[in-house]
């Protein structure tokens, strides 16, 4: 119901498509939602290894 | 901390509807997915479906005809029903919830299901 | 459906030494530059816990002794070194394409 076809980009792709301000992607269902509605993943406690990089999760500039 | 709660019977016979509840404290089930998983004795685990945000549901299509995923945000909980079950249905069932990635990092304890004449 | 086909179902480990575990998925589970690939231990009596997502990501307060690599179809967790508490068994999940799949499981035991 949520994967139509679609490209299969790699690892260094582009973001998805941008979101207006104030909205995030929702990954699993492919679309701009309000950022409230989206929970990312627990902060790493400070000090931790391998930040997580930008992702299209994020609002856009 | 988001904190996951199982309940409903532990037996239930052949042909018979399950219906399991998740209750859910530490956020609002008017966010992010809420999903229901089994695990089959032997290890093997199937995710069953979800309902986000929004009230849309996603349901394999291994138990589409059979399957039902509902919630009261009133009550901050939301509910399995799984019809016409067989002895292939007898599981451990789980609430979990997802961040954005789908990676499940919170689940209930899990709810022991037995179905048997 | 994207089947994700574990390797070995089993492992014996000695204290101290390094487990690897392989995922290796039908199709790829990569999109818009993410690998859509988690993996979480299960012990007896209790629910699966996230260990990784995203293939590489440690969750949040777990030992850096895990680790996750791979893109596309093939996926590993390694845990160095091994320590008594981690006799488990270790699924790999997809989120890419429904229906979201998990791995059969890998059983990690002592030697």
């Known amino acids: 119901m949520r994967r139509g076809p679609r490209s299969l980009r790699g690892r260094d792709a582009p973001a998805p498509t941008p979101c207006v301000p104030a909205e995030c992607f929702d990954l699993l269902v492919r679309h701009c939602v309000a950022c409230g509605l989206l929970r990312a993943p627990r902060p790493k406690p400070a000090g931790a290894s391998s930040p997580a990089p930008r992702t299209a999760l994020q609002p856009q500039e | 901390e988001v904190q996951l709660q199982e309940s409903g019977p532990s037996l239930v016979k052949p042909s018979q509807t399950l219906s399991l509840t998740c209750s859910v404290t530490?956020?609002?089930?008017?966010?992010?997915?809420w999903n229901w998983i089994r695990k089959f004795p032997g290890n093997k685990l199937e995710f069953m479906g979800y309902i986000n945000y929004s009230g849309t549901t996603y349901y394999n299509p291994s138990l589409k005809s059979r399957i039902s995923i509902t919630r009261d945000t009133s009550k901050n909980q939301y509910y399995l029903q799984l019809n016409s079950v067989t002895t292939e249905d007898t599981a451990t069932y789980y609430c979990?919830?997802?961040?954005?990635?789908?990676?499940?990092?919170?689940w209930g304890q899990g709810t022991t299901l037995t179905v048997s004449a | 459906d994207i089947v994700l086909t574990q390797s070995p179902v089993s492992l014996a480990v000695s204290l101290g030494q390094r487990a690897t575990i392989s995922c290796r998925a039908s199709?790829?589970?990569?999109?818009?530059?993410?690998?859509?690939m988690h993996w979480y231990q299960q012990k007896p009596g209790q629910p699966p816990k996230l260990l990784i997502y995203?293939?590489?990501d440690l969750e949040s307060g777990i030992p850096a002794r895990f680790s996750g690599s791979g893109s596309g179809t093939d996926f590993t967790l390694t845990i160095n070194p091994v320590e008594t508490d981690d006799v488990a068994i270790y699924y790999c999940?997809?989120?890419?394409?429904?229906?979201?799949?998990f791995g059969g499981g890998t059983k990690l035991e002592i030697k």
């Open positions: 199709e790829s589970v990569d999109d818009y530059g993410i690998s859509f």
């Open positions: 979990a919830t997802p961040h954005t990635y789908g990676a499940m990092d919170y």
């Open positions: 530490g956020d609002s089930i008017t966010r992010g997915y």
């Open positions: 995203r293939a590489s």
């Open positions: 999940q997809q989120t890419s394409k429904d229906p979201w799949t």
